[in-house]
Interface confidence: low
């Protein structure tokens, strides 16, 4: 079998197209994850056979191993297979998704096994952690396979960092047959429920065939007993669970639910507890808000983020000037709301390459049938200063008048300065600042207008020079938090001709 290009490993750009050809002396085919992807098989003029696999518009999900094999109808004598591995680095995808069966790792006795957490990018650093303690374990990692070593009967997670985001894998459960110690975990479908909704709590035991489950829960105090359901979970006989299900929760069901597990044979036991809150009505509460005025810079991207706590999950709307915003197909704005935990959410509005027209009044509303919050703020778009005009005039009274007009957001400041030695300024000589002079040699008048439609300030500053007896370089400088801009003009006495 011959694969072209030969590999054995490829790193592809996301959304790219990649063509793999496999050739052999008999009919061949490509396999991926025990599936046969769509491919084009052919018999070549030289009597060899080939199959062409075209991967189009690849995503992180195309990461994995690909095998070229002889068609399985040809019998065991043609059992050769060739493997290549493809990575498609995808920053939006953390670890490659796993089937639930792959999360339960069966080991007989003490043998080496692999925790198969894999990422799409071979450059990422991946660490393995015991779930309870956040210390990385020193186990060799192969980006194509995962972590291989001898593992105790514990739960493990893999971690990596994508950009500035730490990403966790699913939890992997490793257990050996005939484990005698008890390892209990308790989890609830939801730890916060409204009255009338159901409470479902699972108590899971690893590695024992013969166990007793004993529950304590708030209802017991009033003598109302709930019959738990016992189950083999996820299809592994040595993983047993007890499910406590209360179909209609009452406020008095709030409290601690404890699962005590004992091994009948030697009474060795363990217990775990979980707290459940039953609330009268749902709620929405802001946790992290925005200021009354938020600043964005022209042509830069800006993320506006609100963190809130809610149950049940609310609907979230963003509005601008009381009109609902939606993801624009043009990618000018992106809206997203995601879970940070069971009841904590973060909602983001990302303005891509901010435009002046995006300044205005924004509101975020988070609401469900029981509650609502809203948060409003003004978005100010800061625009760099531009000097649009610097002109001079010679009124009949012998004065020299220089007018400087410019725009920007926030409001620009005006600074006038002069320099008398034309040969040496402005580079070699600091200009002299000007203002309203006590000797009345100069007079300054500045007017500011806010242009609503352009959401920026216009500054018009007029400098009147009473008497000019030699050529002067006059500079008008406008500055705001976004930077500055200036222009210069040379003013000559009335008696001298213009150059």
């Amino acid at each position: 079998l011959v694969i072209t290009p030969p590999g054995p490993e490829f790193v592809l750009n996301i959304s790219s197209t990649f063509v793999l050809t496999c050739s052999g002396s008999a009919p061949v085919m490509w396999e991926q994850m025990s599936q046969v992807p769509w491919q084009e098989a052919a018999m070549n003029q030289d009597g060899t056979f080939s199959s062409v696999l075209t991967l189009t518009n690849v995503t992180g999900g195309d990461t994995g191993e690909y095998f070229c094999v002889y068609n399985n109808s040809l019998g065991p004598e043609l059992s050769e297979r060739k493997r290549i591995y493809i990575f498609v680095p995808d920053p939006t995808m953390g670890f490659l998704p796993m089937d639930s069966e792959d999360l339960f790792i069966f080991v007989t006795d003490v043998t080496e096994t692999t925790i198969p957490c894999r990422v799409t990018d071979p450059q990422l650093e991946v660490t393995l952690h015991e779930k309870k303690v956040d210390i990385p374990l020193h186990v060799p990692y192969d980006h194509q396979r995962g972590f291989t070593g001898t593992f105790e009967d514990k739960t493990y997670i893999c971690k990596t960092t994508i950009g500035d985001r730490e990403v966790d894998s699913d939890t992997y459960y490793v257990y050996s047959l005939q484990v005698s110690s008890i390892n209990v975990s308790v989890n609830a479908v939801q730890t916060v429920v409204r009255q009338g909704e159901s409470i479902t709590i699972r108590c899971i035991v690893m590695g024992n065939d013969v166990v007793n489950f004993q529950w304590t829960y708030p209802r017991m105090k009033s003598g109302r007993l709930v019959e738990p359901v016992t189950d083999y979970l996820f299809g592994v006989p040595s993983r047993i669970g007890s499910i406590l299900h209360i179909p209609t929760a009452e406020l008095s069901d709030s409290g601690t639910y404890t699962c005590n597990v004992s091994v009948s044979v030697n009474d060795h036991g363990d217990e775990k507890a979980i707290n459940i809150s039953v609330i009268e009505n749902g709620y929405v509460r802001l946790l992290e808000t925005l200021g009354d005025v938020e600043i964005a810079e022209l042509h830069r991207s800006r993320t506006l983020r609100v963190v809130f706590e809610a149950y049940p999950m609310p609907s979230v709307l963003w509005l601008k000037d009381n009109r609902t915003l939606g993801d624009s197909g043009a990618g000018e704005l992106v809206l997203s709301t995601r879970n940070m935990s069971e009841t904590r959410y973060v909602s983001e509005l990302i303005l891509v390459r901010v435009k002046v027209s995006e300044a205005g009044y924004y509101t975020m509303r988070a609401f469900h049938e029981d509650d609502e919050v809203q948060l409003s703020f003004k978005l100010q778009v800061n625009v760099p200063v531009r000097v649009l005009e610097l002109s001079e005039s010679h009124p009949a009274n012998g004065e020299q008048t220089i007018r400087c007009r410019g725009r920007g957001m926030p409001q620009p400041n005006v600074t006038w300065s002069t320099c008398r030695d034309l040969k040496r300024c402005p580079r070699k000589l600091s200009p002299t600042p000007l203002g309203n002079s006590s000797k009345e040699e100069s007079q300054l008048e500045t007017n500011v207008t806010f242009w609503e439609e352009d959401q920026e300030y216009e500054v018009v500053s007029t400098l009147r020079l009473r008497h000019v007896d030699q050529p002067l370089s006059v500079r008008c400088m406008l500055q705001n938090s976004m930077g500055g801009d200036s222009q210069e003009v040379t003013v000559v006495p009335h008696s001298l001709p213009f150059k």
Partner: nanobody, 116 residues
Framework: QVQLVQSGAEVKKPGSSVRVSCKAS????????ISWVRQAPGQGLEWIGG????????NYAQRFQGRVTINADESTSTVYMEMSSLRSEDTAVYYC?????????WGQGTLVTVSS
């Protein structure tokens, strides 16, 4: 004391289907999950799927998805496992199993032989 009694041995042709039953007695049938597990000659135990009769929602191992159907008849306290498109490698002893709180209970096993 929970007892699980399975239907008798079956010989099937490749491509056909088989249906194995498991009748429970001596316990609260609807509130205990029943799993189906098989053991091929010389192999370990392999989980096929299971059902919690009270919730009526079966759960299947991925490799059997689409080929196995598990259902429960509460009126007769019986759980059925049907496997279609049989192949010779499906030859195995099929067990039903449940858990009664202090121990696990197994059916006696049903030998299914797939042969042309």
């Amino acid at each position: 004391q929970v007892q699980l009694v399975q239907s008798g041995a079956e010989v099937k042709k490749p491509g056909s289907s088989v249906r194995v039953s498991c009748k429970a007695s001596g316990g609260t049938f609807s509130r205990h999950a029943i799993s189906w597990v098989r053991q091929a000659p010389g192999q370990g135990l392999e989980w096929i799927g299971g059902i919690l009769p009270i919730l009526k929602t079966p759960n299947y191992a991925q490799r059997f998805q689409g080929r196995v159907t598990i259902n429960a008849d509460e009126s007769t306290s019986t759980v059925y496992m049907e496997m279609s498109s049989l192949r010779s490698e499906d030859t195995a002893v099929y067990y039903c199993a449940t858990h009664g709180g202090d121990r696990s209970y197994w059916g006696q096993g049903t030998l299914v032989t797939v042969s042309s």
